[in-house]
């Protein structure tokens, strides 16, 4: 009886079971009464990273400069070539076909978590004792400035976006 | 509908090359492969080389010194040569595919002076 | 080379009487990939051969189930059940597992 289903990495073709072409290799011809599953190498920058019975092999992902991409990991034969962003910029989704600047976290905000080539800046409010002057992708919000460490009293309050603004003490005559 | 159709000289001298063409239709050569069979007069068959789909090929060790298989998939022909020819190469020469039971109808090759 | 020997050579049967056929390979014929490809034709008289049964035990299409081949590794058989006139002919075993491909010396069947 020819059979209904094949064992893993087989497939089921003109009621025969045939092999398929391991991960790097595409299909040239099916399995005969006579002959195995005849497979080819992938050619250069191209890949097909599973077992299977494409005709064709993928082609490597283009990491285009223009984009702001670069190269993270070359293909191979089994594996697509891995992109990422240039240095400042990340990538805009998953697949990482094209990246955007890092965002910078604005006065009142520091950054939580730098920016990768994957991921975007997370910036933070800064919180009651901090502040953050300047609009950056790289600095964290600042302590404000102790006065009494320095012997010097607060004379101007520090927010969010300014350092408190420390004086002599009042002497008393 | 599959088929195959070899076409060769009929007379060939001692010493001359052969040469016969397979052409078929109702498939194509880059999907499948063909092999070569000969039978001589009143003995059985013997296997002579094949044209893999991918484009390789596999001769017989006794014919390997003197055999060619080369194809032209845009014209669906797989052509045979073979040089050196002797009277032992008199035979009816087939070409066959490697799945199903396709076979042509056989060309007879006579090497005679 | 691999070579395949087959027995008898000559094999006279009387018509409805069973016959078989025996191909012994000089190497197994087990691929890598745990297929057998060991096959068996009949050549009729004035034709080209016809396939019988590929991979041991498959009868090929339109052959009627008289036929049956069995065996592995290096031991082969093919048996006839009932033996019927347009069965004349010499029968080849034939093995594709290496190359080169090779055919056995061919048995003759004819009725007594």
């Known amino acids: 009886e020819p059979p209904t289903a094949c064992r893993e990495k087989q497939y089921l073709i003109n009621s025969q079971c045939c092999s398929l072409c391991q991960p790097g290799q595409k299909l040239v011809s099916d399995c005969t009464e006579f002959t195995e599953t005849e497979c080819l190498p992938c050619g250069e920058s191209e890949f097909l990273d599973t077992w299977n019975r494409e005709t064709h092999c993928h082609q490597h992902k283009y990491c285009d400069p223009n984009l702001g991409l670069r190269v993270q990991q070359k293909g191979t034969s089994e594996t697509d070539t891995i992109c990422t962003c240039e240095e400042g910029w990340h990538c805009t989704s998953e697949a990482c076909e094209s990246c955007v600047l890092h965002r910078s976290c604005s006065p009142g905000f520091g950054v939580k978590q730098i920016a990768t080539g994957v991921s975007d800046t997370i910036c933070e409010p800064c919180p009651v004792g901090f502040f953050s002057n300047v609009s950056s992708a790289f600095e964290k919000c600042h302590p404000w400035t102790s006065c009494e460490t320095k012997d010097l009293v607060v004379q101007q309050a520090g927010t969010n976006k300014t350092d408190v603004v420390c004086g002599p003490q009042d002497r008393l005559r | 509908q599959v088929q195959l159709q070899e076409s060769g000289p009929g007379l060939v001298k001692p010493s001359e090359t052969l040469s016969i063409t397979c052409t078929v239709s109702g498939f194509s050569l880059s999907r499948y492969s063909v092999y070569w069979i000969r039978q001589p007069p009143g003995k059985g068959p013997e296997w002579m080389g094949m044209?893999?789909?991918?484009?390789?090929?596999d001769y017989s060790t006794s014919l390997k010194s003197r055999l060619t298989i080369s194809k032209d998939t845009s014209k669906s022909q797989v052509s045979l040569k073979m040089s050196s020819l002797t009277a032992a190469d008199t035979a009816v020469y087939y070409c066959?595919?490697?799945?199903?039971?396709?076979w042509g109808q056989g060309t007879l090759v006579t090497v005679s002076s | 080379e691999l070579q395949l020997t087959q027995s008898p050579l000559s094999l006279p049967v009387t018509l409805g009487q069973p016959a078989s056929i025996s191909c012994r390979s000089s190497?197994?014929?087990?691929?890598?990939?745990?297929?057998?490809?060991l096959h068996w034709y009949l050549q009729r008289p004035g034709q080209s051969p016809r396939l019988l049964i590929y991979?041991?035990?498959n009868r090929f299409s339109g052959v009627p189930d008289r036929f049956s081949g069995s065996g592995s590794g290096t031991d082969f058989t093919l048996k006839i059940s009932r033996v019927e006139a347009e069965d004349v002919g010499v029968y080849y075993c034939s093995q594709s597992t290496h190359v080169p491909w090779t055919f056995g010396g061919g048995t003759k069947l004819e009725i007594k």
């Open positions: 066959v595919r490697t799945d199903g039971d396709y």
């Open positions: 991979k041991v035990s």
């Open positions: 190497q197994s014929l087990a691929s890598s990939q745990g297929n057998t490809y």
């Open positions: 044209m893999w789909g991918g484009g390789s090929t």
